[in-house]
């Protein structure tokens, strides 16, 4: 129980097209040191949705202040959802490494389904 766990509490989230989707993720520990990334899909073909360390992700906002000391909440919100955003999203903890960070642990995944925009 002491080792870091990646918690993605929602197994499934359904959002209407045009709305924002909140994907929740938290860590149970600050150790090991290293960034959090969000991906859509798993394996070699997964798509990077958000990288805590670097990059520009205009549709993604973090739900809590990630720079805040002792922050364990790495939930994100994705704006203006379209059917193309459907899929399973994984919150992944990386361990700081040299030269590259190493994947440490992944959440169980949250399946995002997109409903037609209400008329």
């Amino acid at each position: 129980e002491d080792e870091l766990q990646v918690i993605q509490p929602e197994k499934s989230v359904s959002v209407a097209a045009g709305e924002s989707a909140t994907l929740r993720c938290a860590m149970t520990s600050l150790i090991p040191v290293g960034p959090i990334m969000w991906f859509r899909g798993a394996g070699a073909g997964r798509e990077l949705i958000y990288n805590q360390k670097e990059g520009h992700f205009p549709r993604v906002t973090t739900v809590s202040e990630l720079t805040k000391r002792n922050n364990l909440d790495f939930s994100i919100s994705i704006s203006n959802i379209t059917p193309a955003d459907a899929g399973t999203y994984y919150c992944v903890k990386f361990r700081k490494g040299s030269p590259d960070d190493v994947e440490f642990k992944s959440g169980a995944g949250t399946e995002l389904s997109v409903r037609a925009k209400p008329s």
Epitope: E1, Q5, I7, Q8, P9, E10, K11, S12, V13, S14, R24, A26, T28, L72, D73, S75, T88, A108, G109, E111
Partner: antibody, heavy 120, light 112 residues
Framework: QVQLVQSGAEVKKPGSSVKVSCKAS????????ISWVRQAPGQGLEWMGG????????NYAQKFQGRVTITADESTSTAYMELSSLRSEDTAVYYC?????????????WGQGTTVTVSS | EIVLTQSPATLSLSPGERATLSCRSS???????????LDWYLQKPGQSPQLLIY???NRASGVPDRFSGSGSGTDFTLKISRVEAEDVGVYYC?????????FGGGTKVEIK
């Protein structure tokens, strides 16, 4: 051995509020999901909402939205459920239950229940 | 929200008989990770509910092996191979795939 111990029975007047506590002992608190489930006399089980203390914010069933507030105090490993604008139909046994937040293990630990009676 | 429908409403059995309880969901409870997010609970008279089966078919700790869960997607079954007097109570299914978490209406098991 994890245990959930709930506060005692309450008798309330219509229109008032009730706050029920659920203290966890013997295990990790912040990363588990605490749900509140109620059971009216002779009726089935009804999920009211739940909280994972590590996130701080709660999820609520739409039926109770605006009338129920679920909170958690990590320092005392205690969860709370407050229900306002009480009516006679809120007379029920209120349970807290613990589950791992991924849902893999079901609600494996339940409190003993708190009877709330709403009567004028 | 996901609606769970249980049948029958009441099951009256003699000790040693086999019990079959059904739970049907209004939408699939099968996640892309391969798990079915359906649990079974037993509430004995005057007691808090207790977990019997999680993820559709996994027995919770301490649950006798006469209880078994099966099914996938929208149709689930709880079987009690040989009913005993201590098995009386109301059995509920629950879906944990998405919030709001919902329960079935329950099946009451009684001994003749």
């Amino acid at each position: 051995q994890v245990q959930l111990v709930q506060s005692g029975a309450e008798v309330k007047k219509p229109g008032s509020s009730v706050k029920v506590s659920c203290k966890a002992s013997g295990g990790t608190f912040s990363s588990y999901a605490i749900s509140w489930v109620r059971q009216a006399p002779g009726q089935g089980l009804e999920w009211m909402g739940g909280i994972i203390p590590i996130f701080g914010t709660a999820n609520y069933a739409q039926k109770f939205q605006g009338r129920v507030t679920i909170t958690a105090d990590e320092s005392t490993s205690t969860a709370y459920m407050e229900l306002s604008s009480l009516r006679s139909e809120d007379t029920a046994v209120y349970y807290c239950a613990r589950a791992k937040p991924r849902g893999d293990y079901g609600m494996d630990v339940w409190g003993q229940g708190t009877t709330v009676t709403v009567s004028s | 929200e996901i609606v769970l429908t249980q049948s029958p409403a009441t099951l009256s059995l003699s000790p040693g008989e086999r019990a079959t309880l059904s739970c049907r969901s209004s939408q699939s409870l099968l996640h892309s990770n391969g798990y079915n997010y359906l649990d079974w609970y037993l509430q004995k008279p005057g007691q808090s509910p207790q977990l019997l089966i999680y993820l559709g078919s996994n027995r919770a700790s301490g649950v006798p092996d006469r209880f078994s869960g099966s099914g996938s997607g929208t149709d689930f079954t709880l079987k009690i191979s040989r009913v005993e007097a201590e098995d009386v109570g109301v059995y509920y299914c629950l879906q944990a795939l998405q919030t709001p978490i919902t329960f079935g209406g329950g099946t009451k098991v009684e001994i003749k």
